[in-house]
C-alpha cells in the first residue's frame, strides 16, 4: 500500500481467483484514543472500533472511503483504491490502446518545435467518475523539471456504438535547450482513477522523436506565362523554431487529381517555392518535415489548382 | 577549415557533407521498431557517446560569439563515431554489404572530420568504450543504438553548418 495523495491510498493486488488479497491497517488521524468507530462509504454499518482498523482487501467491494467517527463526529477519512496485477502485468482497463506507432501505446505525444513544449493525449470509452493526474521530468535518476497543466477533455468521437473521449495535457520543460542534442529522454507519467480503480501509464521519448511541424502557411500559386506550370510558394509555420537558418525544414509538394486513384506527382525541396504542372481539377498540397532528423511530416496545406 | 588557432571552416562544404551524413544515418537505420528485437532493454550501452550539450556553444548565439568550442565538440564526436563504425561492432557478423549506407557513412564521417581539422592540428579526442559483443544479435542491438544516437548527433551538426553557411560565411 502507498499514498497517492493526502488521505488517498493505493492497494496493489495480485488479481486471480481466490487470491488472498492484502492486509491493510488503517489509522485514524486523531489524538483521541477511545470510542472510535469505522464505516465504509455511505453505509452506517460499523466495521470495527479502535484507533486502528485491520482489513483484508481482496476485491473492489473492500475498497472505498473508510471513515473514523467519534460520537457522530467525523475524525478522518482514508480512500482506498485498487491497482490490479494480472499474471504479473498491471491492468490497463481505463485507457484505450492506440496501437500507433506500436501495440500497447496508451499515451501519444507531439511537439510543434524544439522549445521543450509538448502535448500528450490518450483515449478512453469511460465518461464519468474519471480523474487524471500528469507528472513529467527529463530523465529519471536525476530528474530535471517539466511542468504539466491539468488534463482536459479535448474531443469526443462516436466509434460504432461507442463514444470515445480524448483527453490531452500540455507540458513545458522548465530549462529547455532547443539547440542541444538530447541525451536523457522526457518521462511522462499519468495516474488514472476510475471509481475505485487506479492505473498508471508512462511514456518515454526524446522531443526530437515526437516533432511534428504545423503545416506550411500562406500557400500561394502564381501561374507562369504561356505555360501550364505554376510557381507554388509557402512560408514556414509560425510555431516552428527560429532562426530558420538553424532549424531548417524540408518540404514535399504534391499534385493530386480529383480521384484518389490518379497518380500523384511529388517534388521534394528545401526551398519555400517550387514549380509544378497544375492539372485541371487537381489540388496542390505542401507538407513539412525537419530537414535533418526524420520525425513526422506535418499535415498537408492545400490549395485548388483552378 | 577550423583550426585550433581559430580560423573559419569551409562552412558550405561542411553543410553539404553534414546534410549527406544525415541522409546516410537514416539509410543505415531507417526505422525504430522495424527490427523489433525483444531484448533491446535499456542497458545504457551508448551513454558514453559524446553529446552536443547546452554549454557547448552550438546554438546560434554561441556560434556567433565563438564557433570554435562547438566545432571542437563536433570534431570530437565525428572521430568517436568514425572509430565506432570501424570497430568489431560493425565489422563483425553480420558483415556489412560493400555498397551499404553504413559503409558510406563511415567514410563521410572521416571526410567531415578532416574538413574540420587538417593534418597537423590536434584536438583532443574521446576514447571509445571497449565493447566487443560475442553474439551477432548483441552486435545488432549495439549497431541500432549507435546509429540512433548518431542520427541525433549529425542532425545538430548539420544545423550548425547550415546556420554557419547562411550567417557566418565570409
Amino acid at each position: 500500500i502507498w499514498e497517492l495523495k493526502k488521505d488517498v491510498y493505493v492497494v496493489e493486488l495480485d488479481w486471480y481467483p481466490d487470491a488472498p488479497g492484502e492486509m491493510v491497517v488503517l489509522t485514524c488521524d486523531t489524538p483521541e484514543e477511545d470510542g472510535i468507530t469505522w464505516t465504509l462509504d455511505q453505509s452506517s454499518e460499523v466495521l470495527g472500533s479502535g484507533k486502528t482498523l485491520t482489513i483484508q482487501v481482496k476485491e473492489f467491494g473492500d475498497a472505498g472511503q473508510y471513515t473514523c467517527h467519534k460520537g457522530g463526529e467525523v475524525l478522518s477519512h482514508s480512500l482506498l483504491l485498487l491497482h490490479k496485477k494480472e499474471d504479473g502485468i498491471w491492468s490497463t482497463d481505463i485507457l484505450k490502446d492506440q496501437k500507433e506507432p506500436k501495440n500497447k501505446t496508451f499515451l501519444r505525444c507531439e511537439a510543434k518545435n524544439y522549445s521543450g513544449r509538448f502535448t500528450c493525449w490518450w483515449l478512453t470509452t469511460i465518461s464519468t467518475d474519471l480523474t487524471f493526474s500528469v507528472k513529467s521530468s527529463r530523465g529519471s535518476s536525476d530528474p530535471q523539471g517539466v511542468t504539466c497543466g491539468a488534463a482536459t477533455l479535448s474531443a469526443e468521437r462516436v466509434r460504432g456504438d461507442n463514444k470515445e473521449y480524448e483527453y490531452s495535457v500540455e507540458c513545458q520543460e522548465d530549462s529547455a535547450c532547443p539547440a542541444a542534442e538530447e541525451s536523457l529522454p522526457i518521462e511522462v507519467m499519468v495516474d488514472a482513477v476510475h471509481k475505485l480503480k487506479y492505473e498508471n501509464y508512462t511514456s518515454s521519448f526524446f522531443i526530437r522523436d515526437i516533432i511534428k511541424p504545423d503545416p506550411p502557411k500562406n500557400l500561394q500559386l502564381k501561374p507562369l506565362k504561356n505555360s501550364r506550370q505554376v510557381e507554388v510558394s509557402w512560408e514556414y509555420p509560425d510555431t516552428w523554431s527560429t532562426p530558420h537558418s538553424y532549424f531548417s525544414l524540408t518540404f514535399c509538394v504534391q499534385v493530386q487529381g480529383k480521384s484518389k486513384r490518379e497518380k500523384k506527382d511529388r517534388v521534394f525541396t528545401d526551398k519555400t517555392s517550387a514549380t509544378v504542372i497544375c492539372r485541371k481539377n487537381a489540388s496542390i498540397s505542401v507538407r513539412a518535415q525537419d530537414r535533418y532528423y526524420s520525425s513526422s511530416w506535418s499535415e498537408w496545406a492545400s490549395v485548388p489548382c483552378s | 577549415r577550423a583550426v585550433p588557432g581559430g580560423s573559419s571552416p569551409a562552412w558550405t562544404q561542411c553543410q553539404q557533407l553534414s546534410q549527406k551524413l544525415c541522409t546516410l544515418a537514416w539509410s543505415a537505420h531507417p526505422l525504430v521498431g522495424h527490427m523489433d528485437l525483444r531484448e533491446e532493454g535499456d542497458e545504457e550501452t551508448t551513454n558514453d557517446v559524446p553529446h552536443i550539450q547546452c554549454g557547448d556553444g552550438c546554438d546560434p548565439q554561441g556560434l556567433r560569439d565563438n564557433s570554435q568550442f562547438c566545432l571542437q565538440r563536433i570534431h570530437q564526436g565525428l572521430i568517436f563515431y568514425e572509430k565506432l563504425l570501424g570497430s568489431d561492432i560493425f565489422t563483425g557478423e553480420p558483415s556489412l554489404l560493400p555498397d551499404s549506407p553504413v559503409g558510406q557513412l563511415h567514410a563521410s564521417l572521416l571526410g567531415l572530420s578532416q574538413l574540420l581539422q587538417p593534418e597537423g592540428h590536434h584536438w583532443e579526442t574521446q576514447q571509445i568504450p571497449s565493447l566487443s559483443p560475442s553474439q551477432p544479435w548483441q552486435r545488432l542491438l549495439l549497431r541500432f543504438k549507435i546509429l540512433r544516437s548518431l542520427q541525433a548527433f549529425v542532425a545538430v551538426a548539420a544545423r550548425v553548418f547550415a546556420h554557419g553557411a547562411a550567417t557566418l560565411s565570409p
Epitope: - | P30, H34, E93, L97, D99, P136
Partner: antibody
C-alpha cells in the same frame, strides 16, 4: 505500421509473362530492399532474388536467372517482379519481403503472397 | 550454394510436450541462421533471428541455439496453435537458402 501489399492472383499460359507488384507503406522505401521468395503448392520456400531500392542493385537466384527482372518505382514505393517464359513448375505463391540494405538479415516483414498459376 | 537440411521432416506431438527441430548447414554460416513459422494459407512469420535472438511478440516458449553448422529450434511446452511448418533460412551468403521444412502436427 509497416505493410507490404501484393497484387492479386494470376492465371497464365506456359510461355507467357507475369508481373507481380508489391506496394509498401509505413517506412521510407529507399532505405530498404525487397527480396522475392516463392513457394510451390505443398513445397518449401525458394529465394528468387533481391533488389535494393537504395541503389537499384539486383541479385538473382540461379534457377530463375535470365527469366526474371526485379524493379522498383520509388515514386509509388512499389517493387515489381516480372517472370518470363513461364513453365508449369513456376506455379507458386510469390512473396515479397523487406530486405536490409546494410547487412544480410532475416526476413522480418512479408507480403500476403500472390498466387500465380501456369496452366495450358 | 549453402544447403540447409532440417530434421525431422514431420513430427506429431501432444500439447505440453517439448519439441526440437534441427537445421544443419553444408558449410559454416556463423550465426546467420533464422527460423520461421508458417501456418496454412498464411505468409511465413519470423520467430528467431541470428540463431538465438527472440523477436518481439513471439511467445517465449520459442528459443533457438547453435552456431557454425548445427542449429536447433526448441518449442517448450507446445500449444495447439503451434501446429505449422517451420523453416530455417541462412543469410550468410547469396543465394539465400531455406531448409526443406518441418511439419508439426498436434495429436
Amino acid at each position: 505500421q509497416v505493410q507490404l501489399v501484393q497484387s492479386g492472383a494470376e492465371v497464365k499460359k506456359p510461355g507467357a509473362s507475369v508481373k507481380v507488384s508489391c506496394k509498401t507503406s509505413g517506412y521510407t522505401f529507399t532505405y530498404y530492399g525487397i527480396s522475392w521468395v516463392r513457394q510451390a503448392p505443398g513445397q518449401g520456400l525458394e529465394w528468387m532474388g533481391l533488389i535494393s531500392a537504395y541503389n537499384g542493385n539486383t541479385n538473382y537466384g540461379q534457377k530463375v536467372q535470365g527469366r526474371v527482372t526485379m524493379t522498383t518505382d520509388t515514386s509509388t514505393s512499389t517493387a515489381y517482379m516480372e517472370l518470363r517464359s513461364l513453365r508449369s513448375d513456376d506455379t507458386a505463391v510469390y512473396y515479397c519481403v523487406t530486405e536490409n540494405i546494410n547487412w544480410r538479415d532475416a526476413f522480418d516483414i512479408w507480403g500476403q503472397g500472390t498466387m500465380v498459376t501456369v496452366s495450358s | 550454394e549453402i544447403v540447409l537440411t532440417q530434421s525431422p521432416d514431420f513430427q506429431s506431438v501432444t500439447p505440453k510436450e517439448k519439441v526440437t527441430i534441427t537445421c544443419r548447414a553444408s558449410q559454416t554460416i556463423g550465426s546467420s541462421l533464422h527460423w520461421y513459422q508458417q501456418k496454412p494459407d498464411q505468409s511465413p512469420k519470423l520467430l528467431i533471428k541470428y540463431a538465438s535472438q527472440s523477436i518481439s511478440g513471439v511467445p517465449s516458449r520459442f528459443s533457438g541455439s547453435g552456431s557454425g553448422t548445427d542449429f536447433t529450434l526448441t518449442i517448450n511446452s507446445l500449444e495447439a496453435e503451434d501446429a505449422a511448418a517451420y523453416y530455417c533460412h541462412q543469410s550468410s551468403s547469396l543465394p539465400y537458402t531455406f531448409g526443406q521444412g518441418t511439419k508439426l502436427e498436434i495429436k
